[in-house]
C-alpha cells in the first residue's frame, strides 16, 4: 500500500477519508488504528458500530471519531483538536473475525497554527513527503455534519 499524507493544523480538526470497494467489504466493520513503529502492531483507536447497518453513526474515542458510508464506500475519520502527538502513521482497516485488511495507510502531519505565537518548539514538523514511497498529500479541511445530514442507512 502507498501512504497517503493528510496535513492538519494544530488545534483544528482534520478529516481523513479512506475509500474502499463497497462490494468487497460489504457487511464488514471498519477501524482506525495507529501504527506502532515501522514493523510493529497497529493499535486500535476506534472502530465503527458493532451493528454494521449502523456504521453510519459517528463513534468517538476521545478526540477521534469514525463513520462509514457503506453504500458509497468511504470511511471517514475525524481528529478533533489536532495535537502534535497525533502526528504519525495510521491505517484504515476492514475487519473480518480477528483479522483486518488495510484499506489505506495514512501519515498524519500536524502543522503549526500560524496564528499561535507561543513557543512551537514541541511541535513536530514533518520531513519531506518524498521519504514515503509515492506518498500522496491531501490538505484536509473538515467541517461538522449539519443536523439531519446523516446519510440514510442502507437496507439489505
Amino acid at each position: 500500500h502507498n501512504t497517503t499524507v493528510f496535513q492538519g493544523v494544530a488545534g483544528q480538526s482534520l478529516q481523513v477519508s479512506c475509500p474502499y470497494d463497497s462490494m468487497k467489504h460489504w457487511g464488514r466493520r471498519k477501524a482506525w488504528c495507529r501504527q506502532l513503529g515501522e514493523k510493529g502492531p497497529c493499535q486500535r483507536v476506534v472502530s465503527t458500530h458493532n451493528l454494521w447497518l449502523l456504521s453510519f453513526l459517528r463513534r468517538w474515542n476521545g478526540s477521534t471519531a469514525i463513520t462509514d458510508d457503506t453504500l458509497g464506500g468511504t470511511l471517514t475519520i475525524t481528529l478533533r483538536n489536532l495535537q502534535p502527538h497525533d502526528a504519525g502513521l495510521y491505517q484504515c482497516q476492514s475487519l473480518h473475525g480477528s483479522e483486518a485488511d488495510t484499506l489505506r495507510k495514512v501519515l498524519v502531519e500536524v502543522l503549526a497554527d500560524p496564528l499561535d505565537h507561543r513557543d512551537a518548539g514541541d511541535l513536530w514538523f514533518p520531513g519531506e513527503s518524498e521519504s514515503f514511497e509515492d506518498a500522496h498529500v491531501e490538505h484536509s479541511i473538515s467541517r461538522s455534519l449539519l443536523e439531519g445530514e446523516i446519510p440514510f442507512p442502507p437496507t439489505s
Epitope: K24, H96, E99
Partner: antibody, heavy 118, light 107 residues
Framework: EVQLQQSGAELGKPGTSIKLSCKVS????????MHWVNQRPGKGLEWIGR????????VYGEKFKNKATLTADTSSNTAYMQLSQLKSDDTAIYFC???????????WGQGTLVTVSS | DIQMTQSPSFLSASVGDRVTINCKVS??????LNWYQQNLGEPPKPLIN???SLQTGVPSRFSGSGSGTDFTLTISSLQPEDVATYFC?????????FGSGTKLEIK
C-alpha cells in the same frame, strides 16, 4: 451468474513447477479476495492462501509459503497459482474460491486435478 | 493454528432421522464458522454461514448453532440427497482451517 472456470488436469514431474488458472466470469475479481484450497485423494480440505487481486497482497498457510505463489491478472479477470518443487504428496485436487464482504467461499471453481509422478 | 475437531468422522442414519454433526474449535472463533457439503468429485457447497445463517437456496431442514468453540450442524429430517461429506471452516483468523469431515450415509 458468477462462475469460476479452472484450467485442466495437470501431470507434473517431481522437482518441476506448474501454474493453475481460475477465470472468473460474472464478477470483477478486483471486488473479491481469491482463495486456493486443496484436497488430497480421499482426504479433507486444506487452505493454501489468499490474494487480493486489486493490489496483489497475499496471505499463505505456513505449509505453502515456499510451495505456492498466488497472482492475479485483473485485465483478464483470472487468478493463478504456481506450485513449485513438485513432490508426490502435492498430488491433489486444487480449488479456487471467492471471498467478498461476508460471503466466504460461496463460489468455487470445479477443481483441477494435479498428479505428480515421474 | 486453530485446530478443528469434527465428529463423528462417519455417520450412518435412516431417512427421516435427526442428524447432528459437531465441530470443536481449539480457540474462540466467535461465530466465524461455516458449514459446507461436498459430494464426490465436486467442489464444496455452502450450507451455513456465521454459525447459524442458512445459505440462500439451502433447504430449511439444515440448521447451525453454537459460538465460541462448540458448533453443531443439524439435519432435522434426513433425506436421500443429503448423502455427502460435511466440513466446518473457521474464518476467524489466518490460517483458515477446515474440520476433517463427516461422511454421511443412509442406512
Amino acid at each position: 451468474e458468477v462462475q469460476l472456470q479452472q484450467s485442466g488436469a495437470e501431470l507434473g514431474k517431481p522437482g518441476t513447477s506448474i501454474k493453475l488458472s481460475c477465470k472468473v466470469s460474472g464478477f470483477n475479481i478486483r471486488s473479491t479476495f481469491m482463495h486456493w484450497v486443496n484436497q488430497r485423494p480421499g482426504k479433507g480440505l486444506e487452505w493454501i492462501g489468499r490474494i487480493d487481486p486489486a493490489n496483489g497482497n497475499t496471505v499463505y498457510g505456513e505449509k505453502f509459503k515456499n510451495k505456492a505463489t498466488l497472482t492475479a491478472d485483473t485485465s483478464s479477470n483470472t487468478a493463478y497459482m504456481q506450485l513449485s518443487q513438485l513432490k508426490s504428496d502435492d498430488t491433489a485436487i486444487y480449488f479456487c474460491a471467492l471471498e467478498f464482504g461476508v460471503s466466504w467461499f460461496e463460489y468455487w471453481g470445479q477443481g483441477t486435478l494435479v498428479t505428480v509422478s515421474s | 493454528d486453530i485446530q478443528m475437531t469434527q465428529s463423528p468422522s462417519f455417520l450412518s442414519a435412516s431417512v427421516g432421522d435427526r442428524v447432528t454433526i459437531n465441530c470443536k474449535v481449539s480457540q474462540n472463533v466467535d461465530r466465524n464458522l461455516n458449514w459446507y457439503q461436498q459430494n464426490l468429485g465436486e467442489p464444496p457447497k455452502p450450507l451455513i454461514n456465521f454459525a447459524n445463517s442458512l445459505q440462500t437456496g439451502v433447504p430449511s431442514r439444515f440448521s447451525g448453532s453454537g459460538s465460541g468453540t462448540d458448533f453443531t450442524l443439524t439435519i432435522s429430517s434426513l433425506q436421500p440427497e443429503d448423502v455427502a461429506t460435511y466440513f466446518c471452516l473457521q474464518h476467524n483468523s489466518w490460517p483458515l482451517t477446515f474440520g476433517s469431515g463427516t461422511k454421511l450415509e443412509i442406512k
